[in-house]
C-alpha cells in the first residue's frame, strides 16, 4: 500500500516582501526520502526543479531556491511540490512574493532565465546532504 504523502510547506527568507534588487530564498520542506522538489510559479506550467535536497531535521528534507536579484517580474504566487518515489505530492499552500521599490537602491540587473535559482547554505552540518534525481515530468519553464 502506498503511503499518503504529506503536503509540503513553503517559506521565504528573509521574508515575503523583498526590495528590488535584493535576494530571496524559497524554502520547500517535505518528508524524509524526497527525490525532487519543485517550485511552481503562479501555475503548474512554470517551475524549477532541484534534486539537491538536504536533510533538514530528523523527520524532514528540504530544498532551497534562491533568486539573487529580485525584479518586479518575480512578484507573484509560489508553491512547492515534491516527488517521493513512486509519486508526486500535493502542492503546498501558495506564498505570495511582493517586490517593493528600494529607495536609492541599484537598478535590478536583467538575468537569464533560470540563472539565479538555487538554495543557499544552511549552517547545520546535517543539512548538507543531497538527494538523487527523480524522473522529471513536464519540460520546465524556468521561474527566474
Amino acid at each position: 500500500q502506498e503511503e499518503d504523502l504529506p503536503r509540503p510547506s513553503i517559506s521565504a527568507e528573509p521574508g515575503t516582501v523583498i526590495p528590488l534588487g535584493s535576494h530571496v530564498t524559497f524554502v520547500c520542506r517535505g518528508p524524509v526520502g524526497v527525490q525532487t522538489f519543485r517550485l511552481e510559479r503562479d501555475s503548474r506550467s512554470t517551475y524549477n526543479d532541484t534534486e539537491d535536497v538536504s536533510q533538514a531535521s530528523p523527520s524532514e528534507s528540504e530544498a532551497r531556491f534562491r533568486i539573487d536579484s529580485v525584479r518586479e517580474g518575480n512578484a507573484g504566487l509560489y508553491r512547492c511540490i515534491y516527488y517521493k518515489p513512486p509519486k508526486w505530492s500535493e502542492q503546498s499552500d501558495y506564498l505570495e512574493l511582493l517586490v517593493k521599490e528600494s529607495s536609492g537602491g541599484p537598478d535590478s540587473p536583467d538575468t537569464e532565465p533560470g540563472s539565479s535559482a538555487g538554495p543557499t547554505q544552511r549552517p547545520s552540518d546535517n543539512s548538507h546532504n543531497e538527494h538523487a534525481p527523480a524522473s522529471q515530468g513536464l519540460k520546465a519553464e524556468h521561474l527566474y
Epitope: G33, D52, G118, P119, T120, Q121, H128, N129, P133
Partner: antibody, heavy 119, light 107 residues
C-alpha cells in the same frame, strides 16, 4: 541512460598532482549534487568529496583525509565533474569513482579510474 | 564522525538461505541509511535508501529495516547472483561513512 565516465587516473609519484575528470550524460547534471568516492585495493569504500549544484552555490565538502589537498569542481556547461589532487600520498592509491548523488547516498556510479601513488 | 559497525565481516550461506547483515551507527542516523552491493571488479550498486526503500529494478528478495542506530539488511532466499560484498552507509551527516563491508560466499 545515466552514464558517468571517469578519466585521468594513472601512476604518479608521492607529492605529485593529478586531475580526474568525469563526463556525465543521461540526466540533468546541473541540478544534481556530485561526489567522488574511492576504494583502496582490497579495502572498503570511502567518501572523498562532494559538490552541490548551482542552486546551493556550488558548496563543497571534503573528507578529513583529503581536505586541503584535493579540490572538487564542476563545469555545468560541459556536464563534467573534476577532482584536482595535489600533494598525493601513497595512501591515496585507490580506484576513484564519480557518483551522481542522492541526499547523501550514492545512486549512480561510474566505472572508476585507478590512481596509483608510488615511487 | 559517525562510525558504522557492520557485521559479520564475512559469511558463508547456502543457496536458498535467508541471509541477514547488521549495521550499527555510533549515533542516531534517523533512517538515513543506504545499502550497496559490489561484485569483484565492478562499481557498487545502490540497493536500498532511507533504510527500507528498494531502488527500482532491485529484486524483492532484498529488504532493509531498522531505525535509530540499528539497521538490518536481509536477503530472503540467497541466489547465485547475490554473491558479492555488501556495504551500509549513513548519510545523516558529513562525513558520510560506510560500514566495513560483508563478504558473502556460497557454502
Amino acid at each position: 541512460e545515466v552514464q558517468l565516465v571517469e578519466s585521468g587516473g594513472g601512476l604518479v609519484q608521492p607529492g605529485g598532482s593529478l586531475k580526474l575528470s568525469c563526463a556525465a550524460s543521461g540526466f540533468t547534471f546541473n541540478t544534481n549534487a556530485m561526489y567522488w568516492v574511492r576504494q583502496a585495493p582490497g579495502k572498503g569504500l570511502e567518501w572523498v568529496a562532494r559538490i552541490r549544484s548551482k542552486s546551493s552555490n556550488y558548496a563543497t565538502y571534503y573528507a578529513a583525509s583529503v581536505k586541503g589537498r584535493f579540490t572538487i569542481s564542476r563545469d555545468d556547461s560541459k556536464n563534467t565533474l573534476y577532482l584536482q589532487m595535489n600533494s598525493l600520498k601513497t595512501e591515496d592509491t585507490a580506484v576513484y569513482y564519480c557518483v551522481r548523488g542522492g541526499s547523501g547516498f550514492f545512486a549512480y556510479w561510474g566505472q572508476g579510474t585507478l590512481v596509483t601513488v608510488s615511487s | 564522525d559517525i562510525q558504522m559497525t557492520q557485521s559479520p565481516s564475512s559469511l558463508s550461506a547456502s543457496l536458498g538461505d535467508r541471509v541477514t547483515i547488521t549495521c550499527k551507527a555510533s549515533e542516531d542516523i534517523y533512517i538515513r541509511l543506504a545499502w550497496y552491493q559490489q561484485k569483484p571488479g565492478k562499481a557498487p550498486r545502490l540497493l536500498i535508501s532511507t533504510a527500507t526503500s528498494l531502488e527500482t529494478g532491485v529484486p524483492s528478495r532484498f529488504s532493509g529495516s531498522g531505525s535509530g542506530t540499528d539497521y538490518t539488511f536481509t536477503i530472503s532466499s540467497l541466489q547465485p547472483e547475490d554473491i558479492a560484498t555488501y556495504y551500509c552507509q549513513q548519510y545523516w551527516s558529513t562525513p558520510y561513512t560506510f560500514g566495513g563491508g560483508t563478504r558473502l560466499e556460497i557454502k
